[in-house]
């Protein structure tokens, strides 16, 4: 079953996916696609990296994090209802049957017409149920899927502001994390 993420029409959606490079700059190919992960790569590819750089992307889809450090989380800009569905993050790890595949379900909700509340700057207060533990094995993942009522765009925005802080690391640790090497 896919882990579910939510965003509102007109906002940016955030789909977390991480791995830990064996060494700094020792990257592996990663692809993102619309649709469940097939045997090879990703179906309907929207973004792809190689061992050095992002080598393919389509409009509205980008990596906001530092992919050279293994943050390959996908941001989808200005989402519409048509962006709903399953997305595949595939980390193409060399070796026998080592690829890591994550199917993430994006649910787009109609935009609220009520005025936006004042943004809370206190991370713990804003997200009291945020997971902050890190998995300990390559097959173990912890995601935001158990937090269906959290606005992921809000998380993404806040994470960008706090990217270099410990709290941003806590957010990162709640995503799909894979260690290599």
């Amino acid at each position: 079953s896919e882990v579910e993420y939510r965003a509102e029409v007109g906002q940016n959606a955030y789909l977390p996916c991480f791995y830990t490079p064996a060494a700094p700059g020792n990257l592996v190919p990663v692809c993102w696609g619309k649709g469940a992960c097939p045997v090879f790569e990703c179906g309907n590819v929207v973004l792809r990296t190689d061992e050095r750089d992002v080598n393919y992307w389509t409009s509205r889809y980008w990596l906001n994090g530092d992919f050279r450090k293994g943050d390959v989380s996908l941001t989808i800009e200005n989402v519409t209802l048509a962006d709903s569905g399953i997305y595949c993050c595939r980390i193409q790890i060399p070796g026998i049957m080592n690829d890591e595949k994550f199917n993430l379900k994006l649910v787009i909700k109609p935009a609220k017409v009520t005025p936006a509340p004042t943004r809370q700057r206190d991370f713990t207060a804003a997200f009291p149920r945020m997971l902050t533990t890190r998995g300990h094995g390559p097959a173990e993942t912890q995601t935001l899927g158990s937090l269906p009522d959290i606005n992921l765009t809000q998380i993404s925005t806040l994470a960008n502001e706090l990217r270099d802080s410990r709290l941003a690391n806590d957010l990162r640790d709640s995503g799909a994390t894979i260690r290599i090497g």
């Epitope: 190919p29 790569e41 179906g43 792809r48 049957m97």
Partner: antibody, heavy 123, light 107 residues
């Protein structure tokens, strides 16, 4: 256009190792986006995917054969190979090498295949 | 593994007729389904990939449809060179698996 040329013995004794090689021309075996595969077809029967090795080094073997299969690439010779150990008569089949090229626009057309090699396992 | 079941096993038709071949997966393969044609002594040739996309150089009389578990290959008007064995193949889950084939023979 990529072309695949297979080579290897057509007769292998039981318990020995079947070895086949596929030489790639018209392209580099280390080019991004390619998946180099082996498929077999038992006489008068359907097709069975043995496994593949990708440009990125990912390797997948059919679970039914995993313990006996090795697929490897020799970039210096622009070749990839199949080794199947401890063969029995049930491994008698036509063996094909094939490649899938991942094209961002068109998907996965498996339209490059070797000519096929009939391998008979018999003493 | 995903089991692919094709029907009928044999289909006897005349040139100019319409052929409809079916393929059913034991679980959903989304649209990750391909159709191949194989003639005696030859390697399989890709006709359709991702359920409905014609491969390069494949005539328009070949079309594919379906998603999930049920798929169809249609040949709108049979040509003499179309009589062969047809296989469906899924690439949704490893291992990649094929159907047992449908033999299309001249009536």
């Amino acid at each position: 256009q990529v072309q695949l040329q297979q080579s290897g013995p057509g007769l292998v004794k039981p318990s020995q190792t079947l070895s086949l090689t596929c030489t790639v021309s018209g392209g580099s075996i280390s080019s991004g986006g390619y998946y180099w595969s082996w498929i077999r077809q038992h006489p008068g029967k359907g097709l069975e995917w043995i496994g593949y090795i990708s440009y990125s080094g990912s390797i997948y073997y059919n679970p039914s054969l995993k313990s006996r299969v090795t697929i490897s690439v020799d970039t210096s010779k622009n070749q990839f190979s199949l080794k199947l150990s401890s063969v029995t008569a049930t491994d008698t089949a036509v063996y094909y090498c094939a490649t899938a090229y991942y094209d961002l626009l068109t998907g996965y057309p498996f339209d490059y295949w070797g000519q096929g090699t009939l391998v008979t396992v018999s003493s | 593994e995903i089991v692919m079941t094709q029907s009928p096993a044999t289909l006897s038709l005349s040139p100019g007729e319409r052929a409809t071949l079916s393929c059913r997966a034991s679980q959903s393969v989304s649209s990750y389904l391909a159709w191949y044609q194989q003639k005696p002594g030859q390697a399989p040739r890709l006709l359709i990939y991702d359920a409905s996309n014609r491969a390069t150089g494949i005539p328009a009389r070949f079309s594919g449809s379906g998603s999930g578990t049920d798929f169809t290959l249609t040949i709108s008007s049979l040509e003499p060179e179309d009589f062969a064995v047809y296989y469906c193949q899924q690439r949704s889950n490893w291992p990649i698996t094929f159907g047992q084939g449908t033999r299309l023979e001249i009536k």
